[in-house]
């Protein structure tokens, strides 16, 4: 069976094809090639010698138990390599030879037992090495890795490393790789020798599922000091064992390294305490708790020097009472519990993301709402109920604002935006809206993209709502249940690029709404019941038009609308997947494609 | 179509069939089965998929006595620091996994229970399996 | 056990043509991949040429227009002609056959 051209001459996908040896029927130029769950067995020398151009090899689960001296050699060009689930049990000491750019090598499952004899010294462009979920037991750092100064990524994860020495890390006394990219997380872990990361600089320490007991983690935690961590992760997974007992006394040590950003990632334990236990992490820049949960919400008050808190898919009791001066970005998304927002004071706070909590606001949105002047970005979508009461007083700086999937009510009895003359970005798109009042985007002067699909509006009629948003490059309108517009409609839209008016319930086409919109590049009329044209003579669309969508519409093919289906065939270089586009009516000519027609009148007569 | 038994349990009776080509080999084991009353235990799971496990979700289909329910979407891994810690598993890594589940005071009719798991995941998204689960419920009190 | 041996190399100067010629032992070489791989001291090597059992050929940008391999079945020999050498070509060329091993390399050297 022959491997699945995915990119003709560059990327091939011979998965599960029962391949013995390597395929050599493919271009010399193939670039990617995923030659997985094929029973390979052994790779001798030059093994991909027919692959001169190869960047990335995928060799997962071919059964290799030998690699030979040189198996790679020629692959020059090769930036990734993945052995993944392979049971090697003869690695020659020159198997990655040849590998000259090689950035990433995934040696996951491998059994490989050391780092000490696996044969990698001498890629120095390596950016990124998985050795996950194999039998290694120490975690001495092998001299080689001095030459590896590109590292980037080390994942030791779900081995067997039980203690780290001082001596283990000597390596990374002679070449601080400032980058570096730890993950230790499910290791059986039970001593880290105090002094073993004094004076270590790494980029991301990750330890989860690591401690079997508090005290294990206690002291494991006290031995990290010393440490310099851009970002720390601590916590454990929800499919493995947990600790049976969490307090303040875990994170401690935590005060004798210097973090920049911390994240706690799923805990199985009620946090009561958030002062106590996160004492040493008042001054970290970034700080945040996914899936945990929450029992007293007003210890977020605390004067806690966090620039930026991130509170994902965790539990409360209620709404969390928030109270942070310095901090300046908030997510708070996917979290269960207090339904309602109440009131946060954030004084500096520039990012709000208050998505996906099923949150219902009864008066929205001003700056008493969130306690600062200077936010720019405010993503409120996929919650419930939320009142329009105020137009953004206060919030003037806003720049992003995004409400999609939520329902918005009272947004046809005043101008709601009207303050937001900075706003470029607006996402009403699915909000229950039923747009009823022409002044509904006043003070919009620097809108750039208007997403307002799955909507509603008056006696299904657009009228002349978007006057004032003359830099508006992007709309789209789909979903609306539109059958009409006025002929106004787009006069001001001088710099749209892209209009989407899919999914509506037109039944005739007009140019004529579109001939100030001198930029536009894309007009989607697809899903429509588009018949025929309203006028019998249909003008040009603006000369900047390149797509055209007409698909999926209730064309006429009859004699009658023989003018409006030559005007179709003469946008044909404008027009998209025109094979989509079919006769409805009449019944003989259902489902032909409108462009293959030769429609000539006689022909009906 | 080739049947494969899950449990049987004093109320509920479980078992599944692919439903996609590939049919690559999934082992499922509950223990104890499923009691549609009530309910507690561990479910295993030992698969070796054929992509990144990377943003997992589920699509579920559910059919009770041939009404069908709205589709259901389960984001099981978001893409990093997931909850779960298969979400890390790469395409050809072993998966072997016990999760421990629980539900309670829900009252379920008499009758045949269908349910379409369609595993999507990666980047691009493909589906990584399909299985139809049916479960037969015969409450055994009211 | 797979033998390979090359012959033909020696110093020329810049501008003149060399023959390589490899003969393989222990194989028949009808349905092996074959090739020729070059390796300069303090350089990265490369292969020069390679040639599929249908007969189809692979040369990289820096020899295109002056090697040319061919390879003859019935005498278990594959060929390398180098034209218009340079200086650079100046290297230890190896017979590869992609997947069972190398010769030991025949010197080549040009001169100016």
């Known amino acids: 069976e022959p491997c699945v051209e995915v990119v003709p001459n560059i990327t091939y996908q011979c998965m599960e094809l029962n391949f013995y040896k390597i395929p050599d029927n493919l271009p010399f130029s193939t670039k990617n090639l995923d030659l997985s769950f094929n029973p390979l067995r052994h790779l001798g020398s030059y093994s991909f010698f027919s692959f001169p151009e190869l960047q990335v090899l995928d060799l997962s689960r071919c059964e290799i138990q030998t690699i030979e001296d040189g198996a790679y050699q020629s692959l020059s060009h090769l930036s990734t390599l993945i052995l993944t689930g392979n049971p090697i049990q003869s690695l020659a000491l020159g198997a990655f030879s040849g590998l000259s750019s090689l950035q990433k090598l995934v040696a996951v499952e491998t059994n490989l037992a050391s780092l000490e004899n696996f044969p990698i010294g001498h890629l120095k462009t390596l950016k990124e090495l998985n050795v996950a979920h194999n039998l290694i037991q120490s975690f001495k750092l092998p001299e080689y890795f001095s030459n590896l100064t590109n590292l980037e990524h080390l994942d030791l994860s779900s081995n067997k490393i039980q203690s780290i020495y001082c001596t283990d890390l000597r390596v990374l006394h002679q070449m601080p790789l400032l980058n570096l990219s730890l993950d230790l997380s499910l290791n059986p872990m039970n001593f880290i020798q105090p002094g073993a990361f004094k004076e270590i600089r790494l980029h991301k320490l990750t330890l989860r599922n690591n401690f079997d007991s508090l005290n294990v983690m206690k002291t494991c935690i006290q031995g990290l000091a010393g440490l310099e961590v851009h970002r720390l992760v601590l916590g454990e997974f929800r499919n493995e064992g947990n600790l049976e007992k969490f307090d303040k006394s875990a994170l401690e040590g935590l005060c004798n390294l210097t973090i920049e950003e911390f994240r706690l990632a799923y805990l199985d334990y009620y946090l009561d305490d958030i002062i106590d236990l996160f004492n040493c992490l008042t001054n970290v820049s970034s700080f945040s708790l996914v899936s945990v949960t929450i029992e007293r919400v007003k210890d977020f008050s605390y004067n806690f020097g966090w620039q930026h808190l991130e509170l994902v898919n965790c539990k409360f009791g209620q709404f969390p009472t928030l109270k942070l001066k310095s901090l300046k970005r908030l997510t708070f998304t996917s979290n269960k519990g207090g339904n309602a927002f109440s009131e946060v004071d954030l004084p500096s706070l520039e990012f709000l993301d208050l998505s996906r909590n099923g949150l219902s606001f009864k008066g929205c949105c001003s700056q008493s709402d969130f306690g600062t002047t200077s936010l720019k970005y405010l993503d409120l979508s996929f919650n419930g109920v939320i009142t329009m009461s105020s137009n953004f007083l206060g919030l003037e700086q806003l720049e992003h604002l995004d409400f999609q999937h939520s329902n918005l009510k009272q947004m046809s009895e005043f101008s709601v935006f009207l303050s937001l003359r900075n706003l470029i970005y607006l996402d009403i798109s699915h909000t229950h809206t039923r747009v009823a009042f022409n002044g509904i985007f006043n003070g919009l002067s620097s809108l750039e993209v208007l997403k307002m699909a799955g909507n509603s509006f008056q006696e299904n009629f657009l009228p002349d709502i978007f006057t004032e948003l003359r830099n508006l490059t992007f709309l789209d309108l789909s979903q609306c249940q539109l059958e009409q517009l006025s002929p106004t409609a787009f006069n001001s839209l001088s710099s749209l690029q892209v209009l989407n008016m899919s999914h509506n319930n037109f039944f005739s086409l007009d140019t004529f709404p579109y001939k100030c919109l001198n930029s536009l590049q894309v007009l989607d009329y697809s899903l429509n019941h588009i018949m025929t044209s309203k006028k019998q003579e249909l003008q040009h669309f603006p000369s900047s038009l390149a797509f055209l969508n007409l698909t999926q519409n209730d064309f006429a093919c009859t004699c009658e609308h023989q003018s409006f289906l030559q005007w179709i065939k003469d946008q044909r270089q404008l027009l998209v997947e025109v094979e989509r586009m079919e006769c409805a009516t009449p019944s003989d000519k259902q489902g032909m494609p409108v462009l293959s027609l030769n429609i000539t009148c006689q022909m009906n007569k | 179509q080739k049947q494969y038994w899950v449990c049987n349990s004093s109320d509920a009776s479980i078992s599944y069939t692919y439903c996609d080509k590939m049919q690559y080999p999934i082992s499922i084991n509950v223990n104890p089965c499923i009691e549609l009353k009530r309910s507690k235990g561990l479910l295993h799971i030992f698969y070796i998929p054929r992509r990144d496990l990377k943003q997992l979700y589920f699509n579920l289909y559910i059919t009770v006595n041939t009404m069908n329910l709205p589709k259901r979407k389960e984001v099981i891994c978001r893409g990093s620091d997931d909850d779960y810690s298969f979400c890390r598993a790469l395409k050809g890594e072993t998966v072997n996994t016990t999760i421990s589940f629980s539900f309670k005071g829900i009252k379920f009719s008499k009758g045949k229970y269908k349910c379409v798991v369609e595993a999507i995941s990666g980047s691009p998204e493909e589906m990584l399996f399909c299985l139809e689960f049916v479960i037969l419920h015969q409450p055994n009190s009211n | 056990e797979v033998q390979l041996v090359e012959s033909g190399g020696g110093l020329v100067q810049a501008g003149e043509s060399l023959r390589l010629s490899c003969v393989a032992s222990?194989?028949?070489?009808?349905?092996?991949?074959m090739g020729w791989y070059r390796q300069a001291p303090g350089k990265q090597g490369e292969s020069v040429a390679i040639i599929k059992t249908d007969g189809s050929t692979y040369y990289p940008d820096s020899v295109k227009g002056r090697f040319a391999i061919s390879r003859d079945n019935a005498k278990n020999t594959v060929y390398l002609a180098m034209n218009s050498l340079k200086l650079e070509d100046t290297g230890v060329y190896y017979c590869?056959?992609?997947?069972?091993?190398r010769g030991q390399g025949t010197q080549v050297t040009v001169s100016s």
């Open positions: 222990g194989i028949s070489i009808s349905t092996e991949v």
């Open positions: 590869i056959i992609a997947g069972r091993g």
